[in-house]
């Protein structure tokens, strides 16, 4: 999938951490569709 | 050690495409993401987006996202990333860095220098 | 986006000085925000995460503060290898985003 950031957006990330994705695990899975 | 090794310097005509190739080593690859960043010739550090390796999900500055196409090869554990459309204010040096979560882009390549010239 | 102002943009200081780089951002990025070295011709180099944090391998001699939207970069006695150019640049959310850079020259 891909995101697209640069535009003005809410965010509702906690304080204590950062809102970037992160690391990835090979744990991740793709969402389906 | 961690190494992160980009292709040599190009040179096209505006309207072009370039691909610009990061090999990374001394780490595993699949770990962290890869970001690219370019920097125009007496200017700043614009960060152009990044790509995961595993998912290869992407997330873009919206000001490139029409024209980048960022991609990966994990068998080699290299990042590419090739910008379309090229015009001569892309003449830049281009970096990959691998971005942690914790510390941001914690290692760079060496750049790679493109120039866009008639 | 957030925008980061660094100031200021060029400064001239000698070997054995203390200098302080800020970084002010547009809003609060809590507590993330990296340095970066740069000198001609070279790729950026990570000195300082998390606002604070020292990178593995940079001398003590450099130190970030700060939190929210006002941080600081202080070299406590200069060194001849440490006149280059200064980049803030945060990482709390997406877009990520340098500052303009500090431009350090040996007066």
């Known amino acids: 999938s891909e995101t697209t950031t640069g535009t003005s957006s809410n965010s509702s990330q906690s304080t204590s951490n950062s809102g970037l994705a992160p690391n990835p695990t090979n744990a991740t899975t793709k969402a389906a569709g | 050690q961690v190494q992160l090794v980009q292709s040599g310097a190009e040179v096209k005509k505006p309207g072009a495409s370039v691909k610009v190739s990061c090999k990374a080593s001394?780490?595993?690859?699949?770990?962290?993401?890869m970001g690219w960043v370019r920097q125009a010739p007496g200017q700043g550090l614009e960060w152009m987006g990044e790509?995961?390796?595993?998912?290869?999900?992407?997330t873009f500055n919206q000001k490139f996202k029409s024209r980048v196409t960022m991609t990966r090869d994990t068998s080699i554990s290299t990042a590419y990333m090739e910008l379309s459309r090229l015009r001569s204010d892309d003449t830049a040096v281009y970096y990959c860095a691998r971005r942690d979560y914790g510390t941001s882009l914690d290692y760079w390549g060496q750049g790679t220098t493109v120039t866009v010239s008639s | 986006d957030i925008q980061l102002t660094q100031s200021p943009s060029f400064l001239s200081a000698s070997v054995g000085d203390r200098v302080t780089i800020t970084c002010r951002a547009s809003k609060s990025i809590s507590k993330y925000l990296a340095w970066y070295q740069q000198k001609p011709g070279k790729a950026p180099k990570l000195l300082i995460y998390?606002?604070?944090t020292l990178h593995s391998g940079i001398p003590s001699r450099f130190r970030g503060s700060g939190s929210g939207t006002e941080f600081t970069l202080t070299i406590s006695s200069l060194q001849p290898e440490d006149f280059a150019t200064y980049y803030c640049q945060q990482h709390n959310e997406y877009p990520i985003i340098f500052g303009q850079g500090t431009k350090l020259e040996i007066k």
């Open positions: 998390a606002g604070s």
């Open positions: 790509i995961n390796p595993i998912t290869s999900d992407k």
């Open positions: 001394g780490y595993d690859f699949t770990g962290y993401h």
